[in-house]
Amino acid sequence: QPPPPPPDATCHQVRSFFQRLQPGLKWVPETPVPGSDLQVCLPKGPTCCSRKMEEKYQLTARLNMEQLLQSASMELKFLIIQNAAVFQEAFEIVVRHAKNYTNAMFKNNYPSLTPQAFEFVGEFFTDVSLYILGSDINVDDMVNELFDSLFPVIYTQLMNPGLPDSALDINECLRGARRDLKVFGNFPKLIMTQVSKSLQVTRIFLQALNLGIEVINTTDHLKFSKDCGRMLTRMWYCSYCQGLMMVKPCGGYCNVVMQGCMAGVVEIDKYWREYILSLEELVNGMYRIYDMENVLLGLFSTIHDSIQYVQKNAGKLTTTIGKLCAHSQQRQYR
Amino acid sequence: SAYYPEDLFIDKKVLKVAHVEHEETLSSRRRELIQKLKSFISFYSALPGYICSHSPVAENDTLCWNGQELVERYSQKAARNGMKNQFNLHELKMKGPEPVVSQIIDKLKHINQLLRTMSVPKGRVLDKNLDEEGFESGDCGDDEDECIGGSGDGMMKVKNQLRFLAELAYDLDVDDVPGNNQQATPKDNEISTFHNLGNVH
């Protein structure tokens, strides 16, 4: 490439270029000037830049740096944003299916328990969804509430269907008996373990993806220091003052400037690496009871087994509960 | 035992679900995401170099700009002058990160700690001889990681059933489910394919 022509004797070309950034010709000298007031593009000889032009170039440098950062992170940002949205939607679908499977199980196997069972199942899976999205709900409480609500219905509809209406106010007693007598065996505890482990992992996975987006957004919109702005201006725009629009910065010089400007950003590197490796470790462990898809879509089966367990022990239970809750109107069993 | 939906009998007919070997599951999608993320593991350390390589710098040109003047690209002067008068470059590095960067580093530290805490402990052994408290011995113990339930024939094999792209969308109207005595999930005709989860490359 031929050497660039000597600087424009009239600053005409500099004006044309600067005009695109700042319409109006007021800031560009007609002919080269000493430029003694310049603070960034310190001239070795006459210059076509003014102090105002320097300021505009500094603003342009910062904007350009922001653009370069944003285009550098575009692919990464898109990857995480898309996946966060896709996984969130997929988890919601899993929850919806799990609810439908459970409702179908009740409808097919225990029609007498509907529609109350549908209501309790619906509330449980609503809480599951809210938990995944970060709500401050206790998983054990969710599971306990499901079984506490189900047992009175199971008792009055399946185990004691002939119970007179007058006896239907023993629900509180039955809820208490459910826990103390472990009427569902260890199934509630099992479900608590599985659901809490799988949901915790799912929740932290989504939180981690959303934080990933926040990290990139933060570095995308960093406001660079004045010193950095001056360094960038020197590298990218000071040549314009000499009428040298097409010259490029020396490669090593660019690296020095960028490392200086991004010293703070580069400090994220250690934690970013750790973030990706920790996320990988989490994902590698997301199987069996740590996989909410696996756990939630199998819940209907475990709930079914827990009801069968109650039915299997119905004789003993009915006798015990009959004694415990016989006078529940006077003395609520706790 | 209550079987996973794929194995259920509905109206004495087996619910058939087509198996497509390469279908994408949530877990395969998670692994794919991690692989892609790992290609960005050096993103922040590589950023200065990336920006220089993606903005005009002298490559084939004989002359380049060193901040003050045009110099020969390979001359010592180019390197030397590029380094000096760089507005307290050392001081710039000494200042430390901006408050927003410090904040985001703190958030990363916190999530990393959570992720490590959450990561599944290695080498969990499956204990098949766990007694259940209550009225009768059962299948699963207090903290049995792998037991998904299922009485009678031991542990139930749970398949990763929810396909990611060709998903079994059981958008069920429960009133349509037949009230037979076998445990069941929706009927064949209630299986629709879910399409609007885009495949991100």
Partner: antibody, heavy 118, light 105 residues
């Protein structure tokens, strides 16, 4: 790959105004510079003006000063050219074109063009 | 005001021949800011050459540009039938900001 899609053909009465749009896809719109060039039937190319969306600053050729307004909407990646006080000699194909830039400064070469609006 | 004059107005040649198109500026133009465009009927212009002599991506190497100061040339070494078009030169950086030549057909 950057593409510029222009709005459809317009028929206007003398004295009225016309607003032509140019939607960009691919790349980072805010860091482009967009120029508008027109071509009367059987004639050559004539630069009307240009804008750098990130600055919102527009420049106009002397001939069109006061009659043309070039704007850009970063949120929709769309540039607009409005020409007022239309006369019969304004009958032409109006092109939008992306200008090559170095560090946000347009270098004057138009490397991507819309298909034109008549 | 800088004007660009292109010659000849029309050039009739056969495939395989060499075409030489001229562009003359009324004032000296920096070679960094002179471009050549090709326009086929019913199509938008296409950038061929920038900075007087640099080819853009995808432009065949039979197209070459040269010149400095006030005289610039576009050469098509071996003409192909698809090279039939109008060619415009354009300068940037002098008032008015952008100027096109009238074109060579």
């Amino acid at each position: 790959e950057v593409q510029l899609v222009q709005s459809g053909a317009e028929v206007k009465k003398p004295g009225s105004s016309v607003k032509v749009s140019c939607k960009a896809s691919g790349g980072t719109f805010s860091s482009y510079a967009i120029s508008w060039v027109r071509q009367a039937p059987g004639q050559g190319l004539e630069w009307m003006g240009g804008i750098i969306p990130i600055f919102g600053t527009a420049n106009y050729a002397q001939k069109f000063q006061g009659r043309v307004t070039i704007t850009a909407d970063k949120s929709t990646s769309t540039a607009y050219m409005e020409l007022s006080s239309l006369r019969s000699e304004d009958t032409a194909v109006y092109y939008c074109a992306r200008e090559w830039q170095q560090q946000l400064v347009p270098l004057g070469y138009m490397d991507v063009w819309g298909k034109g609006t008549t | 005001e800088t004007t660009l004059t292109q010659s000849p107005g029309t050039l009739s040649l056969s495939p395989g021949e060499r075409a030489t198109l001229s562009c003359r500026a009324s004032h000296s133009v920096s070679s960094n800011f002179l471009a050549w465009y090709q326009q086929k009927p019913g199509q938008a212009p296409r950038l061929l050459i920038y900075a007087a002599s640099s080819r853009t991506t995808g432009v065949p190497d039979r197209f070459s540009g040269s010149g400095s100061g006030t005289d610039f040339t576009l050469t098509i070494s071996r003409l192909e039938p698809e090279d039939s078009a109008v060619y415009y030169c354009q300068q940037y950086g002098y008032s008015p900001l952008y100027t096109f030549g009238q074109g060579t057909k």
